[in-house]
């Protein structure tokens, strides 16, 4: 199962739920579905308040229990380490796959943290991060921001991923904007 890591803004906008949490147990495999669940301790929620309603405490994250079907395998044994988890809600349960955005909170740049906590949401409605995978590539709409990190280096380590968000400049126009300048 292979997938290109998305721009963190894309991960935020396309997810039903974005939280910060610690993985606190070994995975349990469901004997019927062959899905596994990890026990987590949620410390912050950045997206999903309305979707969750009253059930605002997520205690488990679900994923296929096999690599071949895009299951997520958590490799860190540090139970105090916090992770940013962006996933989908299915029947009120948080689901992730290999392709989901799951990253140690400490590995995120200050700009990315700012994005998840405040800024990415501003661009969700109107703006689209448009991956440029090979040259030439051109904007298909004024609301698209060309994401060129993959052309230069690993997509999640690129400058646009770590420091920029695609945000509305004016109606019908989105541009890359620095998240650094918005950090208090």
């Amino acid at each position: 199962c292979t997938c290109v890591p998305p721009h963190p803004q894309t991960a935020f906008c396309n997810s039903d739920l974005v939280i910060r949490a610690k993985f606190v147990g070994t995975p349990e495999v469901n004997q019927t579905t062959l899905y596994q669940r990890y026990e987590i301790k949620m410390t912050k929620m950045y997206k999903g308040f309305q979707a969750l309603g009253d059930a605002a405490d997520i205690r488990f994250v679900y994923t296929p229990a096999m690599e071949s079907v895009c299951g997520y395998f958590h490799r860190s044994h540090n139970r105090s380490e916090e992770f940013l988890i962006a996933g989908k809600l299915q029947d009120g349960l948080l689901h992730i796959t290999t392709c989901s955005f799951v990253a140690p909170w400490n590995s995120l740049s200050l700009a990315q943290r700012r994005g998840f906590t405040k800024t990415y949401t501003v661009g969700c409605e109107e703006c689209t991060v448009f991956p440029c995978l090979s040259i030439p590539c051109k904007l298909q709409s004024g609301t698209h921001c060309l994401w060129t990190d993959q052309l230069l280096q690993g997509s999640e380590k690129g400058f646009q991923s770590r420091h920029l968000a695609c945000l509305p400049r004016e109606p019908g126009l989105c541009t890359w904007q620095s998240l650094r300048s918005q950090i208090a």
């Epitope: 062959l34 229990a65 079907v69």
Partner: antibody, heavy 113, light 111 residues
Amino acid sequence: QVQLVESGGGLVQPGGSLRLSCAASGFTFSSYAMSWVRQAPGKGLEWVSAISGSGGSTYYADSVKGRFTISRDNSKNTLYLQMNSLRAEDTAVYYCARFLDIWGQGTLVTVSS
Amino acid sequence: DIALTQPASVSGSPGQSITISCTGTSSDVGGYNYVSWYQQHPGKAPKLMIYDVSNRPSGVSNRFSGSKSGNTASLTISGLQAEDEADYYCQSYDFKTYLVFGGGTKLTVLG
């Protein structure tokens, strides 16, 4: 008591086909993922294939992918393994197993000309 | 392919204790609490002795015990008896391939 009984083994020529069955009793069959495991004569155990409780998800070892098909009929409490394009190296006792615990007694499959 | 490493053979005298190790990786033994141990006598089907690392099915003697540390699981048989002579296989859930097995350990009871 929980029981798994395999059947359908026998002698088949290389390139031939065989369908194994496993009749389950003593537990709620549809609540368990099931698998097939085999053991070649004098050798160790090798996982072959697995299927989720609903039958919606199937998994195969690389050595049998594209040749074997696992399926189940929850109304009959029966697990199946359709084996096509059989090779000499598929010769083994085939065991049916419930998730991670209960096994049947096995059925011998011999592939030989 | 044998994914879990077991010693090919171990031996002990009646009344002694022996331990069989089973070493895997973080995606199988180390990643899950789903290690099982099977006893197989010649010409017979494998019999479940331990499941979920350290649980014994009903009917299995309490002389059999299981444990795990990191990527290595262990089966200990205390008060060894002649009927314990058999092949022992470890099995683990595996994120990469669903189920993996050890190559088997032949237990010989001396005397």
